[in-house]
């Protein structure tokens, strides 16, 4: 039939609430074109009667509301004077009770439903609401773990929830709720968002920052006791693990039997914009096998090593 086929990524949708999809393909739909929606390669177009639960509204397909049986492949055909494009959209409908079920159980959630806040920053979540002009949207309410969000750090602005000074506690399951009105009928839209916190933010550059060691060598005599501090700066609310490893194994596990090399207890000092952490490694007795081996201090995504080396011979003794 001379139409160019374009396949869109799968859309995962929540049952029992409105959903709309706009058939746009910028190079084509900018000119004089006709758009027609079909379901599952049917020859019969989707209805344009606004009272129909599923109908075409200009270039949109609108479900009021979406139901379990609506899963399938929908095609919109864009016909221009000299061109024809068929866009295939795979819609998968799932039952989702946001307050009953963990978001982890959902397959392939799109980026709209997985959002990131940056630790220590002023950041925002977006309630993605894609509907045609015929749908009137009311004010948005925001929920976290099924409780309406209140407090000085949160501000609702248009379709966004602004979060000032993001903390680790801000991770979790959020939902934005809005009442949609179409042809005098009201429908609830409830979009669940799973929010994670990233620690790539802070008082300066990427965090955490290992101040010492600096991938350096230390001269140490065979048989001596050695204590080396790992000093790390990190954001106040970080959840990073700080540890020493050798051969990709925690030193306490690697030297589990002999306990010759041990990781110390972590301490920290608090400054206005960051914490300074110290975690040491103790060599009760330096052995030959320790030389030339990188002992790695890890802090989140950051790592730095020390390497022990034998001191250069002191020729003055001769």
């Amino acid at each position: 039939d001379g139409c160019n086929d374009i396949f869109m990524k799968n859309e995962m949708l929540s049952a029992s609430q409105p959903f709309a999809f706009n058939c746009t393909f910028p190079p084509i739909t900018s000119g004089e074109v006709s758009v027609t929606w079909y379901k599952n390669s049917s020859k019969i177009p989707v209805s344009k009667i606004i009272q129909s639960r599923i109908h075409q509204d200009e270039t949109w397909i609108l479900f009021l509301p979406m139901e379990w049986g609506d899963s399938g492949v929908y095609q919109c055909v864009i016909k221009g004077r000299d061109s024809c494009h068929r866009i295939h959209v795979n819609l998968t409908v799932f039952e989702k009770q946001w307050c009953d079920t963990s978001v982890k159980g959902l397959p392939n959630l799109s980026d709209e439903y997985k959002q990131i806040l940056h630790l220590g920053k002023d950041d925002s979540l977006t309630c993605h609401l894609h509907f045609p002009k015929s749908c009137i949207l009311g004010p948005i309410k925001w929920y976290k773990d099924c409780n309406e969000i209140t407090g000085e750090r949160f501000t609702v602005l248009e379709t966004r929830l602004l979060v000032s000074n993001v903390s680790a506690e801000d991770r979790g399951n959020y939902a934005c709720q809005v009442i949609l009105t179409h042809s005098g009928k009201q429908y609830e839209v409830l979009n669940g968002i799973t929010v994670s916190i990233t620690e790539r933010a802070g008082y300066g550059g990427s965090v955490p920052k290992i101040i010492y060691p600096k991938n350096n060598s230390i001269e140490v005599q065979l048989g001596t006791t050695l204590i080396v501090d790992c000093n790390i700066t990190d954001t106040k609310d970080n959840t990073n693990l700080r540890c020493w490893r050798v051969n990709n194994t925690l030193v306490d596990d690697y030297y589990n039997e002999s306990k010759r090399i041990r990781e110390g207890v972590e301490t920290h000092a608090s400054f206005r914009e960051y914490n300074l952490y110290t975690v040491n490694i103790t060599f009760l007795e330096v052995k030959m096998e320790d030389y030339g081996l990188p002992f790695m201090c890890h802090a989140g995504v950051s790592a730095a090593y020390i390497m022990l080396q034998l001191p250069a011979p002191d020729f003055r003794a001769y």
């Epitope: 940056h118 920053k121 002023d122 950041d123 925002s124 000085e152 501000t155 602005l157 602004l162 000032s164 000074n165 990233t198 790539r200 933010a201 802070g202 008082y203 300066g204 550059g205 990427s206």
Partner: antibody
């Protein structure tokens, strides 16, 4: 409609002081961080200071640290910039701006001109 | 201090063209890059925040991309009102720093 109106600019001698004000309306002023940003005669933009919504944190570049102080009066929806020990390189148009999220200065005032000259 | 290198400093283009401006950070700034437009005699206007998010009311012909150190600002189908100056701002790390600006001119 969100409006920001700066005042307090003018001509001042090197070493002198000025206090800029920024009156905000049409927005819940106390919920947002605020910044002062200046534009030099060469049209270069420079960040001058930021204050958190609750007046708890203030941030400055080294070029103004110790000389400039940003403050706010949430009860009166007003932002201030106290400038001391002014230098010729501080000559600029000074804008106040409402910050929605980090770095996102969505609303700007019309600016107030500060000229430092002997 | 993070240095923001904005290029080109000036750019000639025709109406309807797609133009690209880049900002390069001297170190990783994650997504903390904002793009502003400033018309002569006017105040700066926010276009894009967090590298790729379009501010409310900004036409979709404006777009931004990038993360880390390299960022791109694009205007597709250049309009007469777009012929002006654009600035980037990094807000990952204090002090926040602006790029030097890019002045668009009509070819």
């Amino acid at each position: 409609e969100v409006m920001l109106v700066e005042s307090g600019g003018g001509l001042v001698k090197p070493g002198g002081s000025l206090k800029l004000s920024c009156a905000a309306s049409g927005i819940t002023f106390s919920r947002f961080a605020m910044s002062w940003i200046r534009q030099t005669p060469e049209k270069r933009l420079e960040w001058v200071a930021t204050i958190s919504s609750g007046d708890m944190y203030t941030y400055y570049p080294d070029s103004v640290k110790g000389r400039f102080t940003i403050s706010r009066d949430n009860a009166n929806n007003t932002l201030y910039l106290q400038m001391r020990s002014l230098r010729s390189e501080d000559t600029a148009m000074y804008y106040c701006a409402i910050m929605i999220t980090t770095g996102e200065h969505a609303y700007w005032g019309q600016g107030t001109l500060v000229t430092v000259s002997a | 201090e993070i240095k923001m290198t904005q290029s080109p400093s000036s750019l000639s283009a025709s109406l309807g063209d797609t133009i690209t401006i880049t900002c390069r950070a001297s170190q990783d700034i994650s997504v903390w890059l904002t793009w502003y437009q400033q018309k002569p005699g006017n105040i700066p206007k926010l276009l894009i925040y967090k590298a790729s998010n379009l501010h409310t009311g900004v036409p979709p012909r404006f777009s931004g991309s990038g993360s880390g150190t390299d960022f791109t600002f694009t205007i597709s189908s250049l309009q007469p009102e777009d012929i002006t100056t654009y600035y980037c701002l990094q807000s990952q790390s204090y002090p926040w720093t602006f790029g030097g600006g890019t002045k668009l001119e009509i070819k």
